[in-house]
Interface confidence: medium
Amino acid sequence: ADPGQDRTDLLNVCMDAKHHKTKPGPEDKLHDQCSPWKKNACCTASTSQELHKDTSRLYNFNWDHCGKMEPACKRHFIQDTCLYECSPNLGPWIQQVNQSWRKERFLDVPLCKEDCQRWWEDCHTSHTCKSNWHRGWDWTSGVNKCPAGALCRTFESYFPTPAALCEGLWSHSYKVSNYSRGSGRCIQMWFDSAQGNPNEEVARFYAAAMHVNAGEMLHHHHHH
């Protein structure tokens, strides 16, 4: 299925999920790593505050499920969560899902290759017990714990390459782009908002490409 197939509005939109606002807008008090989205965000200040906490109430997800996650690693997971909760520029990759906790998800968001590489480099000595974090946890305590038989090993054991981490971690929410940061063709997890949000241009590019593809398909069906 093509990404974004379920929506006609691809630009400046919020996903229909657990904590997202219905429409993006300014949020002056976004916390710490989520602050780059202040001018236009799908997250509230309280969501941004909460997601910086270990085992936050947002999802009861414990980053430290195999001992303390290195701070250099954890910052990437916080940034990933900020992008997920706050970005209004992921419309081209929204897909409908039938899940109890959300109606939509992202699929194959083209993450800039350096952002993925750096995430992997900063995390490969931290520890985990699973290669897909959407599925298979023991939730009996209310917080994710390693399932029986899942051994705590270094990230590199479960995510041997940058692609295995970025693409496998959240069931293909991301794919690693061939493009580099600043190209206007890939989504940056990290950016300096003083220069504006570079992901706006990326969303415009892919939304336009999707409209062209959709038009070609309509044209093709009309004539055949």
């Epitope: 897909n132 038989g149 590199e156 054991s157 295995a164 293909h172």
Partner: antibody
């Protein structure tokens, strides 16, 4: 456009070795793992092992441990699979496949037929 | 055990719906991927992760999973869907991959 192009068919004698190459293009070679999978005539797919194209780390199926060696040349964006001590049961089509996350093989080479015959 | 079990053969009438299953312990904590292979050709990924279609794969293909069983469903099977279908999964206990034995799908009519 992502492409994996493999070397041509080989005929080998029992006891010999074979080295198959897989040239990747259209993506950043070092960010993905490359796996090798084989298929004997009329048989199922059989996973052999993989290499982390970034740092060269390898993992092999127990069945092939000691007989298979997977290497890569990052400057040529090419992965190699060498199988030694060949026997007739090794007659198969050998595929390289790019891994997006542990067994999601989104691109495959065209396959290389290796025939082991005396 | 790290085995993945598939029915060797399944048939479906043209235009009808068919489900191909894959069973194994590794599927309790890992998603299956599904491949279509036609004679003399390399396999083609048709479903990956939870229920994701690679571009170019028709949306009559879908995937699902429950417990230790993953399923590939083809809704409105076409003659072009006649092929062998393989599941694979990462093995929970190590950094290895295992394939199912394959299912030969015949489209009747």
């Amino acid at each position: 456009e992502v492409q994996l192009v493999q070397s041509g068919a080989e005929v080998k004698k029992p006891g010999a070795s074979v080295k198959v190459s897989c040239k990747a293009s259209g993506y950043t070679f070092t960010i993905y793992a490359m796996h090798w999978v084989r298929q004997a005539p009329g048989q199922r797919l059989e996973w052999m092992g993989w290499i982390n194209a970034g740092n060269g780390n390898t993992k092999y199926s127990q069945k092939f441990q000691g007989r298979v060696t997977i290497t890569r040349d990052t400057s040529a964006s090419t992965a190699y699979m060498e199988l030694s001590s060949l026997r007739s049961e090794d007659t198969a089509v050998y595929y390289c496949a790019r891994d997006i996350s542990y067994g999601s093989f989104d691109y495959w080479g065209q396959g290389t037929l290796v025939t082991v015959s005396s | 055990s790290s085995e993945l079990t598939q029915d060797p053969a399944v048939s479906v009438a043209l235009g009808q719906t068919v489900r191909i299953t894959c069973q194994g312990d590794s599927l309790r904590s890992n998603y299956a991927n599904w491949y279509q292979q036609k004679p003399g050709q390399a396999p083609v990924l048709v479903i990956y992760g939870q229920n994701n279609l690679p571009s170019g794969i028709p949306d009559r293909f879908s995937g699902s999973s429950s417990g230790n069983t993953a399923s590939l469903t083809i809704t409105g099977a076409q003659a072009a869907d006649e092929a062998d279908y393989y599941c694979d999964s990462r093995v929970s206990t190590g950094i290895h991959v295992v394939f199912g034995g394959g299912t030969k799908l015949t489209v009747l009519g």
